[in-house]
Amino acid sequence: MDSFNYTTPDYGHYDDKDTLDLNTPVDKTSNTLRVPDILALVIFAVVFLVGVLGNALVVWVTAFEAKRTINAIWFLNLAVADFLSCLALPILFTSIVQHHHWPFGGAACSILPSLILLNMYASILLLATISADRFLLVFKPIWCQNFRGAGLAWIACAVAWGLALLLTIPSFLYRVVREEYFPPKVLCGVDYSHDKRRERAVAIVRLVLGFLWPLLTLTICYTFILLRTWSRRATRSTKTLKVVVAVVASFFIFWLPYQVTGIMMSFLEPSSPTFLLLKKLDSLCVSFAYINCCINPIIYVVAGQGFQGRLRKSLPSLLRNVLTEESVVRESKSFTRSTVDTMAQKTQAV
């Protein structure tokens, strides 16, 4: 493949038609972006600012507590996944500004857009792990007292990350840079070429493993947890549960458009009008999914304010209060009083 260190003339305004108006000179003047792309840029900018700062703060708060607090381990890993994805945003932003021209080369094309999928799989697998933890705390409190430790939590996170990397491989492998002849533009995208079945298979696996199956299992899981919690009439604040439910719900809300358009595009002919319409919305769907990368710190702050009544504490201490609450009396040998809000009603503190 040719190297792409040349200046790209801007023919963006000819993207959707073959014919150039005889009265329109083929000049290099800049043209306006489509509305979905403008919205995507706004979302990307907000997500980057909130996501980088918010997740950095969460990492900073939870990193100190992760040795002894299991909840901190969960939230630390979620924040790392989100933070990593946010690092790709300036590149994706630049590409959209340049009418989807990709001057960053093949390696960046394979890695950077795949980060959001790595985030998706890592997040949902971590959320599944957290949900399993919440479930065990409610239904197997004795087992938790005996076996629920930081070491096991880290192993679970490592497994989640490993599986996430594995599930991201297809996207990574099929991403290519394509340099179009006219308008002169280098594009970064997936190319399955001869294998439409493989494209559909990847889209179906992504939909099932990254969305439908987790949606079903987590809905069932939290239905049981909430029913048990309400039936016991827990007097203690169930803030970790509320935070986790909010995080899980936001995951599915913000990934929905991406998953729906993705599965539709895999079953449509690339030249069909519906496919072309969905392709125009692609950046917006990706940006909407990217909201996941900044929403968690917002949820934590909102939750913290709710639990505090009003924002009396500093942001780090407010986050620490939300993210490092413990649910079992003796969590590890390094257990200290400071990591627990209250020691009462340990089996109901979910």
Epitope: V26, R178, P184, P270, P273
Partner: antibody, heavy 121, light 112 residues
Framework: QVQLVQSGAEVKKPGASVKISCKAS????????MNWVRQAPGKGLEWMGR????????KYNGKFKGRVTITADESTSTAYMELSSLRSEDSAVYFC??????????????WGQGTTVTVSS | DVVMTQTPLSLPVTLGQPASISCRSS???????????LHWCLQKPGQSPQLLIY???NRFSGVPDRFSGSGSGTDFTLKISRVEAEDVGVYYC?????????FGQGTKLEIK
């Protein structure tokens, strides 16, 4: 009517350079890409590069990068292709061909008559 | 680079009979704007190539209607409903979706 008239045949020694011209008429020279394609004896067609005469913007096939230079003179509606460091395998017929931007065709639609270049010591 | 593979490379045909040439690309030729820039040209003996079909199925001006093109994505076909003597030459498929522009190896049509 569209016409692309190329310069005459050339015989060159290995290591030398050759510069071929292609004079266009019958259409708006500026609103097109001028492409250069070569065909070795008994072989297929191979794209070398293109130029947008309006501003001199060029794109080359990576295979020829560094050896080929495409230029254009808007005032005479002429495109030029220079190939340096010639070797025997560069012996071929060289065609100029236009890609008109203001038509629905969006294909290389008209070709020059070809210029035969022979590289021999 | 996009590799264009033509079959057959040689095609002996009886006058008045139909002929078909296949072209397969190593990558999808669907442009980001939805169009497919796959073309067919004919190089008659001792002449320059001439455009026959552009964008898969559109006949270029002056091309007889016995020539037709079809296909999508990566698989394309040129059909001649009734071969005439003047159709003799080498047929090339080419793509102008991606840089560099690439051509098939050519299919030599000859009269039996």
């Amino acid at each position: 009517q569209v016409q692309l008239v190329q310069s005459g045949a050339e015989v060159k020694k290995p290591g030398a350079s050759v510069k071929i011209s292609c004079k266009a008429s019958g259409y708006a020279f500026s609103n097109s890409w001028m492409n250069w394609v070569r065909q070795a004896p008994g072989k297929g067609l191979e794209w070398m590069g293109r130029i947008y005469p309006g501003d001199g913007d060029t794109k080359y096939n990576g295979k020829f990068k560094g050896r080929v230079t495409i230029t254009a003179d808007e005032s005479t509606s002429t495109a030029y292709m220079e190939l340096s460091s010639l070797r025997s395998e560069d012996s071929a017929v060289y065609f100029c061909a236009r890609f008109l931007l203001i038509s629905t065709v969006t294909a290389v639609d008209y070709w020059g008559q070809g210029t035969t270049v022979t590289v021999s010591s | 680079d996009v590799v264009m593979t033509q079959t057959p490379l040689s095609l002996p045909v009886t006058l008045g009979q139909p002929a078909s040439i296949s072209c397969r690309s190593s990558q999808s030729l669907v442009h980001s704007n939805g169009n497919t820039y796959l073309h067919w040209c004919l190089q008659k003996p001792g002449q320059s190539p001439q455009l026959l079909i552009y964008k898969v199925s559109n006949r270029f001006s002056g091309v007889p209607d016995r020539f037709s093109g079809s296909g999508s994505g990566t698989d394309f076909t040129l059909k001649i409903s009734r071969v005439e003597a003047e159709d003799v030459g080498v047929y090339y498929c080419s793509q102008s979706t991606l840089v560099p522009l690439t051509f098939g190896q050519g299919t030599k049509l000859e009269i039996k």
